[in-house]
């Protein structure tokens, strides 16, 4: 659920980390209405996720460690 590069809502699906290649943080105080994590998938999809949810925080941590280790 995104419009003009801003997420307007969150996915109701859970993405498995193996399908995600990166993420972008969307901040509500930087021109968009809500905070969000935008996951980028191997199939070139962008998926808006709720940054409060544990599965989202978990994958963000996984990806952050991957980037650091590269």
């Amino acid at each position: 659920a995104s419009n003009f590069d801003c997420c307007l809502g969150y996915t109701d699906r859970i993405l498995h980390p193996k399908f995600i290649v990166g993420f972008t943080r969307q901040l509500a105080n930087e021109g968009c209405d809500i905070n969000a994590i935008i996951f980028h998938t191997k199939k070139k999809l962008s998926v808006c996720a709720n940054p409060k949810q544990t599965w989202v925080k978990y994958i963000v941590r996984l990806l952050s460690k991957k980037v650091k280790n590269m």
Epitope: I14, H16, N50, Q53, T54, W55, I59, V60, R61, L62
Partner: antibody, heavy 125, light 107 residues
Framework: QVQLVQSGAEVKKPGSSVKVSCKAS????????ISWVRQAPGQGLEWMGG????????IYSQKFQDRVTITADESTSTAYMELSSLRSEDTAVYYC??????????????????WGKGTLVTVSS | DIQMTQSPSTLSASIGDRVTITCRAS??????LAWYQQKPGRAPKLLIY???SLQSGVPSRFSGSGSGTDFTLTISSLQPEDFATYYC?????????FGGGTKLEIK
Amino acid sequence: QVQLVQSGAEVKKPGSSVKVSCKASGGTFNRYAISWVRQAPGQGLEWMGGIIPMFATPIYSQKFQDRVTITADESTSTAYMELSSLRSEDTAVYYCARDRTDYYDTDGYQSPDSWGKGTLVTVSS
Amino acid sequence: DIQMTQSPSTLSASIGDRVTITCRASQGINNYLAWYQQKPGRAPKLLIYAASSLQSGVPSRFSGSGSGTDFTLTISSLQPEDFATYYCLQDSDYPLTFGGGTKLEIK
């Protein structure tokens, strides 16, 4: 409420490894993050790492990431924590703990509320 | 990583006293803060989650407050069974981090 049953106390030599198990019963296993927390004698609590069983890939605290391996077996509802290259400073009680809410909860207040009784690992030559 | 600083490290009090323990986060964590009680030889017990929500079965003399970086745990009237060590935990982000603990002793 879920019950977490941990394996028994271990005495290990410096340089060796230890593997502690944590079996969950009475709740959904794969929808909750399991954390491993350690407590050295007279010291505070330290989060070592965790795993969402469905994801299989664990996450670790920077302090432990080179020596710890966390896994989960969904078929037996059991999580494992293996610590290698043991030294005397690793003598501690190791706890497994399960999040209060499942990984899809929209507020994400994890605050583990189910804990194992702890496994004492003593490292001594 | 988010650091949690807890104070005091030791607190002496008497039965019936009102006591307050504080926890400060190195960065804003909204209300993603939990409080635990631990007695010797036992696993930690969750008292408060979401900074101020009382965990089921926990006596109402325990209360939590705060948001952002500064949090407090208050015990309104100390009971004999409350003498223990208390820890805060931030669950805003991974890695989860605990405060150093506050040992509550009998004066």
